[in-house]
């Protein structure tokens, strides 16, 4: 019991580092006056419970009264929060919470209330986020078996307990632990901000959390937003225990890659109908997004600062903005936002000074797509602004000319006509095709290089769509290009995959099929409804990784690019997905921006649908995180099963 081996003190006694059967262990030595009942209580709990999230008992002694338990090499969570918060990456924060929730649901399934969940009682074994065992719950001193009715004694630690526990003389149950878990999650998210203050003002510490008056974690502690975790904290900290999720539900919520990777969710003002968006240049001062919106008779340009979530909007045109492009001129050190409108106007505004604005030569029909390409990544060579129109024309402007009022295009290519609009332009993510652009015009896919002559023109009308043959003649709405061409057609629930060399259809990605797999399990929708909600609205390619598909029913499908197998369906993400794009945004580095609509019925007799646009920012690693988390859970399941079997034996 030399002081150098002391790991910690408590009212019960002390914990020492020791060796037992050749292993480093933690030995809990109880005070001389400790009743045998307390030791027995902890022993009863420890002997019957075997789980990867609970500290394992290795041996026990009566003289002196002691418990020999496994040693957590990285110490307690509160030590980490106070001394090494830099180690707490987002993934690690998530895994710690997940492991604690796993332990809690296991205890609760055994009808045990833990009653003292706090960072000090969470022990860490590693800080490697994909390790099978990272965090475990320790110190069962006051854990108690409870009958269905619950228990009454007031226990727990001030500042970390549920209001019903703090009040005393009130029956409480496992839901009290869920409240404490909400506080633990809050402390993980804010890296222990309130604990530091709690040491200064201990009386207020308990008071604030009991009254549910904890300050907003993002505004008060400046931590990065984490929408689904913030929502979970609020649910766990409900005053009424019945309104809190169960520990099993908490675990299920945490067991989701979406929770980890959804980094921002911003609701835009009601009835702002966003048609298009473009992200600021990654070198720019702040992470921000330009949005094109409006109604038929007016075009609104909006600016969203992602750091402050400040949203401003201005009416800039007399007709709806259908597409946007950002033209960055490195030599002039300035950027211009180009808006293409329904009336064919190309409005150009300096991103830093709204007084500097003008129009380019008017197009002959609605501007349906804009693309600022960089055939060369070197600033010495020319870059171009490409403009597609509803009457099938492609206008090419040299990027520098956007500064000039009334500037005319270098060249106009007639690719389609009034019934075959040029709806999309795309650059290949395939490095072997650096100088090739692709587009969709009517039912044709075309390609061209920096001399602006059409190289390929592929007719995509085909009889190979089988039950989706009706969509073969529909106009292409979006094309993305990798080793193959992925195209979506108007109202079609299918993504067609075309081979660039053979110019033949080489695959179909049937969104209805994938949605049905998910929905049949949950008995969600009829086939007709599914076909409607599965219609593809937008595609986005994540280089060498995944194809993101946004549907009209508000679902996001992630497919593995190499196998075209489904990685994940993010079901009912919104009512309708509108725009998806990858972006590099300052500190947010490599994100996927997804813009969707939600329709809400307004109050009153006239059941008008109110539309609210919602912008979400996703960590680009979502496809990897889905797979990592699945593997992680699988390994832990096997471990839990092994421990269960061992305990039975």
């Amino acid at each position: 019991q030399a002081p150098e081996f002391l790991l910690g003190d408590g009212s019960f006694g002390s914990v020492y580092r020791a060796a037992y059967e050749g292993e480093e262990v933690a030995v809990k030595i109880f005070n001389k006056h400790t009743s045998l009942r307390l030791l027995r209580q902890e022993l009863v709990v420890l002997c019957h419970l075997h789980h990867p999230s609970l500290i394992s008992l290795l041996a026990a002694g009566i003289r002196p009264r002691m418990l020999v338990m496994e040693l957590a090499s990285k110490g307690s969570l509160d030590r980490l929060l106070q001394q090494d918060k830099a180690s707490l990456t987002r993934t690690l924060q998530h895994r710690i919470a997940l492991h604690v929730a796993d332990g809690l649901r296991y205890l609760h399934s055994a009808m045990i209330i833990y009653r003292d969940l706090k960072p000090h009682n969470v022990l860490l074994f590693t800080l490697y986020p994909n390790a099978a065992i990272i965090a475990k719950i320790a110190d069962y001193g006051i854990a108690q078996y409870c009958c269905r009715m619950g228990i009454k004694t007031s226990e727990g630690t001030p500042g970390f307990r549920a209001p019903e526990v703090a009040r005393g003389n009130v029956i409480y149950n496992q839901q009290a632990d869920v409240y404490s878990f909400g506080l633990l999650l809050y402390d993980i998210l804010t890296t222990g901000g309130r604990i530091v203050e709690g040491l200064k003002f201990p009386n207020e510490f308990d008071e604030l959390e009991i009254q549910g008056k904890l300050p907003d974690p993002v505004k008060e502690y400046g931590c990065a937003p984490w929408p689904m975790v913030e929502k979970l904290i609020k649910q766990c900290l409900k005053e009424n225990p019945q309104e809190r999720p169960t520990s099993a539900q908490v675990f299920d919520i945490l067991n989701s890659a979406e929770l980890v990777c959804l980094t921002r969710r911003i609701l835009l003002p009601k009835n702002v109908i966003v048609e298009c968006m473009v992200a600021t240049h990654h070198n720019s001062r702040n992470a921000s997004i330009w949005l094109g919106c409006g109604h038929t008779d007016r075009g609104q340009l909006s600016f969203l600062d992602l750091n402050t979530e400040g949203y401003t909007s201005e009416e800039v045109a007399d007709s709806r903005i259908l597409c946007l492009a950002l033209v960055h001129l490195p030599v002039e050190k300035e950027s211009w936002i180009v808006s293409g409108t329904q009336s064919g106007t190309l409005l150009v505004i300096n991103t830093e000074d709204g007084k500097k604005r003008h129009t380019l030569e008017k197009m002959t029909d609605s501007v349906t797509c804009l693309y600022c390409n960089s055939f060369s990544k070197q600033s010495k060579q020319k870059n171009f602004l490409l403009v597609g129109t509803a009457d099938g024309k492609l206008a090419i402007f040299e990027d520098k000319t956007v500064k000039l009022k009334g500037a005319a295009p270098l060249k106009i290519l007639n690719i389609g006509n009034v019934s075959t609009p040029l709806m999309c332009l795309s650059e290949s993510t395939n490095s072997t095709e650096r100088n090739v652009m692709w587009g969709g015009c009517g039912t044709k896919i075309f390609s061209f290089s920096n001399d602006f002559t059409i190289q390929k023109l592929i007719e995509t009308r085909t009889s190979q769509l089988f039950s989706y043959a009706a969509f073969s003649d529909s106009n292409i709405i979006t094309v993305v290009v990798d080793t193959a061409l992925y195209i979506a057609k108007q109202n079609s629930p299918v993504v067609e995959v075309w081979d660039k060399k053979t110019e033949k259809l080489c695959g179909l990605i049937d969104c209805v099929h994938f949605l049905r797999e998910v929905m049949v399990k949950e008995n969600k929708e009829s086939k007709h409804k599914m076909s409607y909600s599965g219609r593809v609205k937008t595609l986005c390619l994540q280089k060498n990784t995944a194809l993101w598909i946004g549907t009209g029913g508000g679902h996001i499908l992630l497919l593995d690019l190499s196998t075209r197998r489904l990685i994940r369906v993010i079901y009912n993400f919104c009512n309708s997905v509108r725009v998806m794009m990858t972006a590099q945004l300052g500190s947010l580095k490599n994100v996927m921006l997804v813009l969707g609509y939600n329709r809400k019925n307004t109050e009153g007799t006239q059941k008008q649908k109110e539309i609210q646009s919602c912008l979400t920012v996703w960590d680009i690693n979502l496809p990897h995180e889905v797979q990592n988390l699945e593997k992680h859970i699988e390994v832990r399941k096997e471990l839990a099963e092994k421990m269960r079997r061992t305990s039975v034996e």
């Epitope: 340009l301 600016f303 401003t312 909007s313 201005e314 830093e352 000074d353 709204g354």
Partner: nanobody, 115 residues
């Protein structure tokens, strides 16, 4: 649709302080330099202070060292902190900016400094 709404005016004793606010809507706020003007009874409107899009401030000589202009792009608001007020500062204070076509004005807020 473009709106500038001033607030914070009132009656104050000489030597006192006031903070005026101007909330802007219907514009992409960070695009524009913002100005405070004032108009005393029977006098012409005069420029008091300007803040550029980058946050640089400029003041009329008669308020230098006493007044301070600032902006909060997230809140789309421009402020005028007025200290050591004098009776001659009594006026209607207007928030304003120049867009690509014309100069826009708020409705003004009355500041009265009693001696």
């Amino acid at each position: 649709q473009v709106q500038l709404v001033e607030s914070g005016g009132g009656l104050v004793q000489a030597g006192g302080s006031l903070r005026l606010s101007c909330a802007a809507s219907g514009i992409i706020f960070h695009w524009y330099d913002m100005d405070w003007y004032r108009q005393a009874p029977g006098k012409q409107r005069e420029l008091v202070a300007t803040i550029t899009t980058g946050g640089r401030a400029d003041y009329a000589d008669f308020v230098k060292g006493r007044f301070s202009i600032s902006r909060d792009n997230a809140k789309t608001t421009v402020y005028l902190q007025m200290n050591s007020l004098k009776p001659e500062d009594t006026a209607v204070y207007y928030c304003s900016f120049q867009d690509h076509v014309l100069r826009r004005w708020g409705q003004g807020t009355q500041v009265t400094v009693s001696s």
